[in-house]
């Protein structure tokens, strides 16, 4: 039976040509995290395997870097990154585990406009 | 006790294919990743490539990628190497290496096959 | 793909003596880098996993230490059969690599 449950930072935006760390927790279970993959849609963007460590996808490799931990940096920013991020956590013997963040990115004076409004 | 044996290497011509097999004993082979290093005469370690235990991912050296194949067969504890299209530079001695499971050390090696490209 | 550079690339030391060699990644690898003992003809022995992790069977002389970009293998007093060329691994990131290597040598 699948027990755990993955906690996710959720919806995150970020100004353009900054960047963002994209983090998942898998908690409430014992089983083995063999491997973690981060995909944007149906694209693959890097995978973190328990044996043979971090492998980035070719057409990334300039802008995402591995970490911290099991998490995801993306690095310069642009308007077409907005979209929805998804964790999948491969366990034994549970089986697979999927988060979801969902990303907005925003032109420099829009997230400056929008801090001024946050409630602290 | 654990123990591994490689096999295929040999004096072939550049351009032309070689298959390396690498025979694991003594130990739960579907349980591990394994790994080709290998070690050109007088020079130091380079990793090749390596799998993890059900085939899922697989990595490679840039100097072989495109022209080399890992693979594995669980139920033969075997581990292979297909090389193609080799080069002068691939002359080597190849060995199969076994890590430390999830530690990514390499605890356990063959004592290595011999590939000499040459015409 | 990450880079290890040891140095030095030689040393020559005497029985007894301490002998420290670094290995330093062009990118930071956390604690994924291991050392390797090799001697003619022979193949590598594994001496320290996760920069600082001994080996089972290996002497307690041997000892590995740093984290992220810089790290160091030490041998705290070298014995006859310590004479050998030794190799820093990264596994981090896919490709996984060695450094270059470092031969002790007898003074």
């Known amino acids: 039976m699948m027990t755990g449950t993955i906690e996710t930072t959720g919806n995150i935006s970020a100004e353009k040509g900054g960047s963002i760390i994209l983090q998942c927790h898998l908690s409430s279970t014992t089983a083995q995290v063999t491997q973690v993959n981060w995909e944007q849609q149906d694209q693959l963007l890097a995978i973190c395997n328990a044996d043979l460590g971090w492998h980035i996808s070719p057409s990334f490799k300039d802008r995402v870097a591995p970490g911290p931990g099991l998490g995801l940096t993306l690095q310069s920013l642009t308007v077409n990154d907005t979209g929805e991020y998804f964790c999948i956590y491969h366990t034994y013997p549970d089986g697979t585990y999927t988060g979801r963040i969902f990303l907005e990115v925003l032109e420099s004076s829009v997230a400056e406009h929008g801090a001024r409004f946050q409630i602290p | 006790q654990v123990q591994l044996v490689e096999s295929g290497g040999g004096l072939v011509q550049p351009g032309r294919s070689l298959r390396l097999s690498c025979a694991a004993s003594?130990?739960?082979?579907?349980?591990?990743?394994m790994h080709w290093v290998r070690q050109a005469p007088g020079k130091g370690l380079e990793w090749v490539s390596g799998?993890?235990?059900?085939?899922?991912?697989?990595g490679y050296a840039d100097s072989v990628k495109g022209r080399f194949t890992i693979s594995r067969d669980n139920a033969k504890n075997s581990l292979y190497l297909q090389m193609n299209s080799l080069r002068a530079e691939d002359t080597a001695l190849y060995y199969c290496?076994?890590?430390?499971?999830?530690?990514?050390?390499?605890?356990?090696w063959g004592q290595g096959t011999m590939v000499t490209v040459s015409s | 793909d990450i880079q290890l550079t040891q140095s030095p690339s030689s040393v020559s030391a005497s029985v007894g003596d301490r002998v420290t060699i670094t290995c330093r990644a062009s990118?930071?690898?956390?604690?994924?880098l291991a050392w390797y003992q090799q001697k003619p003809g022979k193949a590598p022995k594994l001496l320290i996993y996760g920069a600082s992790s001994l080996q089972s069977g290996v002497p307690s002389r041997f000892s590995g230490s740093g984290s992220g970009t810089d790290f160091t293998l030490t041998i705290s007093s070298l014995q006859p059969e310590d004479f050998a060329t030794y190799y820093c691994?990264?596994?981090?990131?896919?490709?996984?690599?060695f450094g270059g290597g470092t031969k002790v040598e007898i003074k």
């Open positions: 290496a076994k890590p430390v499971p999830r530690l990514r050390g390499l605890d356990v």
């Open positions: 691994q990264q596994a981090f990131y896919l490709p996984w690599t």
């Open positions: 990118q930071g690898i956390s604690s994924w």
């Open positions: 799998i993890t235990w059900n085939s899922g991912l697989i």
């Open positions: 003594g130990f739960t082979f579907r349980d591990y990743a």
